[in-house]
């Protein structure tokens, strides 16, 4: 039975040009967490796996950076990152656990004017 | 459970276009994930057509994406297929399935087979 | 678009044998792979996803591994019920595309 919750930072914004930290955490389950997918609906971003380690997707190697942690970092934000990002946690022997973060990216003035969802 | 079930005419002309909606029970098409259309010509391997995403973005194959159209009807929970200009190649088993995440197809129609003759 | 190689196309084993099936990508797709079983008439079924995750009510008979390029499907003893065509799915990045299909009959 799944048991488990993943908390993530739900709906953020960030500034064009800048950076985002992407994070979710797996709670309330005893479950080994073996892999995790950082994806967009059409696309991969990265994988981290438990004995693999991490890897990037080529389309997104220049501007993403794994971690913290399981999480991924994601720099020099231009407004076609604005979407939704899908946490994917494989985990033994729950199975696998999906969260998601919408990204805003806003034009620098916008955002310096602390635009909220 | 979440059920899909394909629907529309099993013989379409070449230069029609063809026509097919997939109607979803047991799951809301807005609720989450992705609706895709999956072909088989007869005898052959399976080629991902395209698909629409709950928030109603489309993303089709590059091979087809000048004659594919797939839309939704969110009052009836359905989404739709249109081919155009349709050739004897396009004769094949079409398949609606959900997409998940990761983005493997774990639900799928039953299947209807469409041929294209004149 | 990424290809996927299945081999080999045909097979045949006796029930109890050990099978494997191969997928080679035409780039890195990490563990990006699904295999999925057909049966005649019928919509393909999903066994494993991510390379080497068995899906919710898929026999344990059935094992995927690989990373890269390179991924197998293993049954570990075959069944007279295993008979299918078994193709192989990225799941990298749109557009998803499929094996050619391993058609695997029982001696």
């Known amino acids: 039975m799944m048991t488990g919750t993943i908390e993530t930072t739900g709906n953020i914004s960030a500034e064009k040009g800048g950076s985002i930290i992407l994070q979710c955490h797996l709670s309330s389950t005893t479950a080994q967490v073996t892999q995790v997918n950082w994806e967009q609906q059409d696309q991969l971003l990265a994988i981290c796996n438990a004995d693999l380690g991490w890897h990037i997707s080529p389309s997104f190697k220049d501007r993403v950076a794994p971690g913290p942690g399981l999480g991924l970092t994601l720099q020099s934000l231009t407004v076609n990152d604005t979407g939704e990002y899908f946490c994917i946690y494989h985990t033994y022997p729950d199975g696998t656990y999906t969260g998601r973060i919408f990204l805003e990216v806003l034009e620098s003035s916008v955002a310096e004017h602390g635009a909220r969802f | 459970d979440v059920q899909l079930q394909e629907s529309g005419p099993g013989l379409v002309k070449p230069s029609q276009t063809l026509s097919l909606t997939c109607t979803v029970t047991g799951y809301s098409i807005t609720s989450d994930y992705a609706w895709n259309w999956i072909r088989q010509p007869p005898g052959k391997g399976l080629e991902w057509m395209g698909y629409i995403s709950y928030s109603g973005s489309a993303r089709y194959n590059p091979s087809l994406k000048s004659r594919i159209t797939i839309s939704r009807d969110t009052s009836k929970n359905q989404f739709s297929l249109k081919l155009s200009s349709v050739t004897a190649e396009d004769t094949a088993t079409y398949y609606c399935a959900r997409k998940g995440y990761p983005a493997y197809f774990a639900y799928w129609g039953q299947g209807t087979l469409v041929t294209v003759s004149s | 678009d990424i290809q996927m190689t299945q081999s080999p196309s045909s097979l045949s084993a006796s029930v109890g044998d050990r099978v494997t099936i191969t997928c080679r990508a035409s780039?890195?797709?990490?563990?990006?792979v699904a295999w999925y079983q057909q049966k005649p008439g019928q919509a393909p079924r999903l066994l494993i996803y991510s390379a080497s995750y068995r899906y919710t009510g898929v026999p344990d008979r059935f094992s995927g591994s690989g990373s890269g390029t390179d991924f197998t499907l293993t049954i570990s003893s075959l069944q007279a019920e295993d008979v299918a065509v078994y193709y192989c799915q990225h799941h990298y990045s749109t557009p998803y595309t499929f094996g050619q299909g391993t058609k695997l009959e029982i001696k």
């Open positions: 780039q890195d797709v990490s563990t990006a």
